[in-house]
């Protein structure tokens, strides 16, 4: 008799979930000499201890403190990329900008970027088949405590100048409800960071408006200025012209407004 | 760059080599061991970050510790020596900052003899 | 067995000739290229002459050169002089179950 299975409305775990992981782990380790002293397979186990066995809407961040330990990984504080609903175009920045890091660019951001995962109560058994959403199922589920954690110490290790890149074609600019505006924002330590600085990127080629005037960049001011840390917004009205003048800042038609 | 603290020891009877570096800080980089046995060829013992972290040869693990006891000294524990240990062991800085495993400024080397 | 094998082990060569090193990996090397070639006279400790398989160490004389990249790796000396006389070695950076340093066997260069 086949056994009862939960069936959860989010898509399942991504195939071939434990050697991928494995796998970007030696990667991320070639690419990045400093953190050669990692060991994959310690990692991986650490991962999977925190999802193994556990029901997959009561996963705590504590669940995964073992990964978060073996993956400490020091990135220059003042060197650090937020972004919110427009990750490709952040992460090819930091692809030309290297000195510059998004929470992707970090061996944790890195194994589990674009992946999904869960377990079931009691087994040993990794769920292929379903995974538990957010919203119809539960918060506390492994992927979203997962970024959660990763995020908020990403933000807390922020210093100096922090920058943002947001989307300017949503509707919510500043959105309260994604990574960004409900882990990162308060995060971000006082002592530490002087400035937030916002790069609303634009969609549309002949949209000139000032998407720094928004409500919505507006209330991440307000909620920015609260905690004493101060709040600059600049319009990126052409986010091709401007990876290309990240690329060649020689050139001539890089000092116009990008 | 300088080791310190080779001599002969009896089997079994744990040895501290000290390397010793002036004119730049281990904070900023990596240092590595490296041993020789009389005669024979290179074999890279492991590597200690300028984070303190520790990585070594499969075949180094349990039987040495490298650990910085100051800003100037790092320290290799030879655990419990044996006939083979026997080698002219040297320490040598990473060539660049959190930089690939590539040695520049290796000290003379120190000499461990292990023999009953 | 030697992760990274040299060969030959040892070769004569006249002053102004040419000498060639073979390093192959049994596996390949990180980033195709992580490679440095060293040279060790009796009693020294070695010397780095090269690094990414190809990069001249500051203060190494251009007859010394590298290439290759992946698993086969070759040092070339042109225009060979006495006091080239020394063990060369070849050192890459590995994964087995972790990354490290490993070294050829070495290969003794005889200046005639």
């Known amino acids: 008799v086949p056994r009862w299975r939960q069936q959860w409305s989010g898509p399942g775990t991504t195939k071939r979930f434990p050697e991928t992981v494995l796998a970007r782990c030696v990667k991320y380790t070639e690419i990045h000499p400093e953190m050669r002293h990692v060991d994959c397979q310690s990692v991986w186990d650490a991962f999977k201890g925190a999802f193994i066995s556990k029901h997959p809407c009561n996963i705590t961040e504590e669940d995964y403190q073992p990964l978060m330990k073996l993956g400490t990984q020091t990135v220059p504080c003042n060197k650090i990329l937020l972004w919110s609903r427009i990750k490709d175009l952040a992460h090819q920045f930091t692809q030309v900008q290297r000195d510059m890091f998004t929470l992707e660019d970090t061996l944790l951001g890195y194994l589990a970027d674009d992946l999904t995962w869960c377990g079931e109560f009691n087994t040993s058994k990794i769920n292929y088949q379903s995974c538990p959403d957010w919203r119809k199922d539960c918060s506390n589920n492994p992927v979203s405590v997962f970024w959660k954690t990763v995020s908020r110490r990403f933000a807390e290790a922020a210093c100096d100048v922090v920058h943002v890149m947001l989307n300017g074609s949503r509707s919510k600019i500043f959105d309260k409800n994604s990574t960004f505006g409900s882990v990162e924002v308060h995060n971000l330590q006082p002592e530490k960071v002087q400035t937030l600085e916002a790069w609303v990127i634009h969609g549309g080629r002949e949209d000139s408006r000032d998407l720094c005037q928004d409500p919505t960049i507006k209330e991440l001011e307000s909620i920015i200025s609260k905690r004493n840390i101060q709040f600059s917004c600049k319009n990126i009205y052409r986010p091709d012209k401007f990876l290309q003048c990240v690329k060649n800042p020689e050139d001539s038609s890089c000092t116009s407004e990008i | 760059v300088e080791e310190s603290g080779g001599r002969l020891v009896t089997p079994g009877t744990p040895l501290t080599l000290t390397c010793t570096v002036s004119g730049f800080s281990l904070s900023n980089y990596d240092m590595t061991w490296v041993r020789q046995a009389p005669g024979r060829g290179l074999e890279w013992i492991g590597v200690?970050?300028?984070?303190?972290?520790t990585n070594y040869a499969r075949w180094a693990k349990g039987r040495f510790t490298i650990s910085k006891t100051s800003s100037t000294t790092v320290d290799l524990k030879i655990t419990s020596p044996t006939t083979e240990d026997t080698a002219t062991y040297f320490c040598?800085?990473?060539?660049?900052?959190?930089?690939?495993?590539?040695?520049?400024?290796w000290g003379p080397g120190t000499l461990v003899t292990v023999s009953s | 067995a030697q992760v990274l094998t040299q060969t030959p082990s040892s070769v004569s060569a006249a002053v102004g000739g040419t000498v060639t090193i073979n390093c192959q990996s049994s596996?390949?090397?990180?980033?195709?290229?992580?490679l440095a070639w060293y040279q060790q006279k009796p009693g020294q400790p070695p010397k780095l002459l090269i690094y990414?398989?190809?990069t001249l160490a500051p203060g190494v004389p251009s007859r010394f050169s590298g290439s290759g990249s992946g698993t086969q790796f070759t040092l070339t000396i042109s225009g060979v002089q006495s006091d080239d006389a020394a063990t060369y070695y070849c050192?890459?950076?590995?994964?087995?179950?972790?990354?490290?340093?490993?070294f050829g066997g070495g290969t003794e260069v005889v200046v005639k």
């Open positions: 050192q890459g950076t590995v994964y087995d179950s972790g990354w490290y340093a490993a």
């Open positions: 596996q390949s090397i990180a980033n195709s290229d992580e």
């Open positions: 200690i970050s300028s984070g303190d972290n």
């Open positions: 990414d398989a190809s």
């Open positions: 040598a800085r990473i060539l660049y900052n959190k930089g690939r495993y590539y040695f520049t400024f």
